[in-house]
Structure formats: structure tokens, C-alpha cells
């Protein structure tokens, strides 16, 4: 099956404080590789998670990643500051023998938005 | 669908003028809209986009502060107050409807001509 | 922000030449690009998006290909119609949402 990476949402609106779930589905887990959320394009874009293993504070996978044929790569942000405002990408990488993975797909993109907490 | 832009004509720099773009023909509080303008002789240029409820707005870096996207779903319409304005905000505004899944603009209106001139 | 440039900037061609039009990104926009169509005192129109999906009455004369960097937008043979200029959009980096500079189609 084609590889495709699917961000459903365009824009996700979250207070302050709240947290916020960020959707990605894929619709082949082949070729092997990881998939990871950044926020940002570019050279200034920032890794927000990896569904490796790595320990990243506020953020967690939606569904167990572990799971034989799991499709679904979402991940919650907790917490959320304005900080935390932009747009995240997941995108799938194809594991290389012995040179850094390669990125081979990305979803189109969610925009996070963060209101001021009501007071 | 159908999207008619109104409001434009001539100002002097620093003055305010408010444009309006009337929607029919699609759920307008369902979609994303957009103001895109073009200025005489130059290409497109993003200006500002407000989400189907209102509540994410975003500006180019060059109007930001100065011009307010707003919209009003009971009346299916479209506004863009400008404040402030420069001679280099003269352009034709279009209004664009954006697609149900990503940023690009399924439909446009035909636009409305601002001229700010001393 | 991811910059676009077309070229060329003017194509003359006569009807039923094949005209074929660039659009270069500053980054990788994937598959995330978008065509239209604006002729004078017309609205624009959306020729392509996905950078290879055609939108609702588009005649098949009119295709994209591209993915990354380099998009490409190919009129197979120019009718009359076709004489306008052609604007393409990323929809991948945002905000802000970047059209390139547009390139001029018209008749020899």
C-alpha cells in the first residue's frame, strides 16, 4: 500500500494550560523507520517527539506505538504556553543501512493555536 | 459558489477603510477564509485568515497591526478593517475560500480595488 | 518562511504549443503546492493542487508534476483561453502562506 501521512486537522485552537491532541495516521508502516513531530520547516524546525523511546516532557503518544500494525502516530501536548504555538509535522523517515535516516513523507501540517487562559 | 468583495476605493495614507466580501452557496461557517491582495503590476500576497468559528486569526507580517479580520457567520460575511493605510497597501483585495482539508483557495471573488494616495 | 520562484517570468508561445512553467521552492514543500489561473478582471482560479491533482473542470490539458523543490506545470497544447498568467502556492510552511512571483503566458 501507497504511503501516505494524514493530519486531518488544519488548526487546533487550545488554552493556555489545557492540553491538545495533534492527529497522524499512516496508512503503511513500510518502508521501516521512525516517525517523528516536529514543529516547524527547516533548518529551525524542533523535534517535539519520536516515537522511539526518548523521554520528552509534556508530550505522549495517543495509542501504544508498540502495537503490531498500529497506524496511529497522535501525540497530546500537556500543558500548553503560548511557547508552544505553531505548526507541528509528522513525518516518517526511512531507516538507512548505516547513514542517517532519510525523510521520506510528511503530513500536511497542524497549526496550533493557543487562546489566552480564561480568567 | 459565490463570492462578492465591496468597500474598496481611495484614501489618504494613514486612513482607515473597511472591506466586506458577502459568501453564498457554500456552509460559510464551515470554511477558512482568506484575504489575498495583489498590487498593480505584482503578484499574490497572502494578507490575513480567520478559521470557519472565528477564533484562529493569523496576518502577514505587513499588515500585522494594522489591518482586523473578522467575520460574521448569521450574515455569511467576510470583513477586513484597515487602519493605517500606506501607499503600499494599494492593491485589489480578493476574499478566498479555502479548501475543507488544506490551505489553498478552492474559490475566489473577483476583488475590490484600494488606492491609498496622497 | 519558504520563498517560490517561477520562471520564467514571460513564456510567448502560439495556440497549440506545449508550454511547460517552474516553480522552484527554497524547501521541501513535499507534495504541497498549488496552481492558478488569473486572467484580467476574472477571479483566480485553481488549476492544481497537490501539486498534481486537478481541480473540479479543469481540462485535461493542464497537468503538474513535481514533489520537493522543483514543481512543474504543463499546458499541453494553449488554446486561446490559456493566454493569462500562472501563480503557484505552498501550503506546507505557514503562516505564512507564499505565492511565487507568477509567470506570464502570452500569444507570439
Known amino acids: 500500500k501507497e504511503l501516505k501521512v494524514t493530519q486531518p486537522e488544519k488548526s487546533v485552537s487550545v488554552a493556555a494550560g489545557d492540553s491538545t491532541v495533534l492527529n497522524c495516521t499512516l496508512t503503511s508502516l513500510l518502508p521501516v523507520g521512525p516517525i517523528k513531530w516536529y514543529r516547524g520547516v527547516g533548518q529551525s524546525r524542533l523535534l517535539i517527539y519520536s516515537f522511539t523511546g526518548e523521554h520528552f516532557p509534556r508530550v505522549t503518544n495517543v495509542s501504544d506505538a508498540t502495537k503490531r500494525n498500529n497506524m496511529d502516530f497522535s501525540i497530546r501536548i500537556s500543558n500548553v504556553t503560548p511557547e508552544d504555538a505553531g505548526t507541528y509535522y509528522c513525518v516518517k523517515f526511512q531507516k538507512g543501512p548505516s547513514e542517517p535516516d532519510t525523510e521520506i513523507q510528511s503530513g500536511g501540517g497542524t497549526e496550533v493555536y493557543v487562546l489566552a487562559k480564561p480568567s | 459558489v459565490q463570492l462578492v468583495e465591496s468597500g474598496g476605493g481611495v484614501v489618504r495614507p494613514g486612513e482607515s477603510l473597511r472591506l466586506s466580501c458577502a459568501a453564498s452557496g457554500f456552509t460559510f461557517s464551515s470554511y477558512d477564509m482568506n484575504w489575498v491582495r495583489q498590487a498593480p503590476g505584482e503578484g499574490l500576497e497572502w494578507v490575513s485568515l480567520i478559521s470557519g468559528s472565528g477564533e484562529i486569526i493569523y496576518y502577514a507580517d505587513s499588515v500585522k497591526g494594522r489591518f482586523t479580520i473578522s467575520r460574521d457567520n448569521s450574515k455569511n460575511t467576510l470583513y477586513l478593517q484597515m487602519n493605517s493605510l500606506r501607499a503600499e497597501d494599494t492593491a485589489v483585495y480578493y476574499c478566498?475560500?479555502?479548501?475543507?482539508?488544506?490551505?489553498?483557495?478552492?474559490?475566489w471573488g473577483l476583488g475590490t480595488l484600494v488606492t491609498v494616495s496622497s | 518562511e519558504t520563498v517560490l520562484t517561477q520562471s520564467p517570468g514571460t513564456l510567448t508561445l502560439s495556440p497549440g504549443e506545449r508550454a511547460t512553467l517552474t516553480c522552484r521552492a527554497s524547501?521541501?514543500?513535499?507534495?504541497?503546492l498549488a496552481w492558478y489561473q488569473e486572467k484580467p478582471g476574472q477571479a483566480p482560479r485553481l488549476l492544481i493542487y497537490g501539486a498534481s491533482s486537478r481541480a473540479t473542470g479543469i481540462p485535461d490539458r493542464f497537468s503538474g508534476s513535481g514533489s520537493g523543490t522543483v514543481f512543474t506545470l504543463t499546458i499541453s497544447s494553449l488554446q486561446s483561453e490559456d493566454f493569462a498568467v500562472y501563480y503557484c502556492q505552498q501550503y506546507y510552511d505557514r503562516p505564512p502562506l507564499t505565492f511565487g512571483g507568477g509567470t506570464k503566458v502570452e500569444i507570439k
Open positions: 478566498a475560500k479555502e479548501n475543507n482539508r488544506y490551505r489553498f483557495f478552492d474559490d
Open positions: 524547501q521541501s514543500v513535499y507534495t504541497y
